[in-house]
Amino acid sequence: DPVKPSRGPLVTCTCESPHCKGPTCRGAWCTVVLVREEGRHPQEHRGCGNLHRELCRGRPTEFVNHYCCDSHLCNHNVSLVLEATQPPSEQPGTDGQ
């Protein structure tokens, strides 16, 4: 089950966000999260994932894109993009179910 969290071998990842305690972190997988809040430029955060692997499978929206990978520093050079703005009649779906 790919959704089931695993606490097996940890991987070292690049950590770049306001909450990083150093340049790298250790986790079950590596993450890149690109977020655009209303009226602000998109921000890209790199770090480690240990819970809720389902976020890795969510489709990109105009507000958020999640990326996950499983090898040493695999999130270091990844750049994400957001989906193009949707017509007003469409609802951005962040719920990946």
């Epitope: 969290p5 909450h19 999260v33 819970l51 809720h52």
Partner: antibody, heavy 118, light 108 residues
Framework: QVQLQESGPGLVKPSQTLSLTCTVS??????????WNWIRQHPGKGLEWIGY???????YYNPSLKSRVTISVDTSKNQFSLKLSSVTAADTAVYYC??????????WGQGTLVTVSS | EIVLTQSPGTLSLSPGERATLSCRAS???????LAWYQQKPGQAPRLLIY???SRATGIPDRFSGSGSGTDFTLTISRLEPEDFAVYYC?????????FGQGTRLEIK
Amino acid sequence: QVQLQESGPGLVKPSQTLSLTCTVSGGSISSGEYYWNWIRQHPGKGLEWIGYIYYSGSTYYNPSLKSRVTISVDTSKNQFSLKLSSVTAADTAVYYCARESVAGFDYWGQGTLVTVSS
Amino acid sequence: EIVLTQSPGTLSLSPGERATLSCRASQSVSSSYLAWYQQKPGQAPRLLIYGTSSRATGIPDRFSGSGSGTDFTLTISRLEPEDFAVYYCQIYGSIPITFGQGTRLEIK
């Protein structure tokens, strides 16, 4: 010390929308280590997970409630919110917000009773 | 969807006795993300055990957790008066997050 506090109306009319807010203090809602959950408990019953939101705004909901639930986050206010539409008496419950980490649901609000009645 | 079944529904014991509470999953779950909570009337649940066997901050060492696969156990080695409450097991860290129906621990 991290604290969570639920707020919102204690009485909602049937068919209306229940709206609650959870204010987080003593820690940042924007930390990537945490997931922000809503849970409810019907009178005298067990705990039911409603859904969670990540700081990015990504959400996942209990399939049994998904069609009626919206969870949102306001990182600038360190708050996240629950909306439950088309409520009935069966939605009368104590509603809790809680922080989830690798160490489980480690911090909870004190809970707020919401009664659905006309 | 994984179902957690707790047994017994009610456990009647005296202070000083040993309590053994069971939580059974309908399919194998990650032991890294199995938690136990204590709830007293009018209060929010309180985290006791996470990752099957790690005690949360401030939890006395009379509380211990064990298990793997589908069978998990919360043990209270010597019951104190304040331990009489309802106990819930939970799977977290993946969706859907699931709670057991609870075990009520009452004074005999």
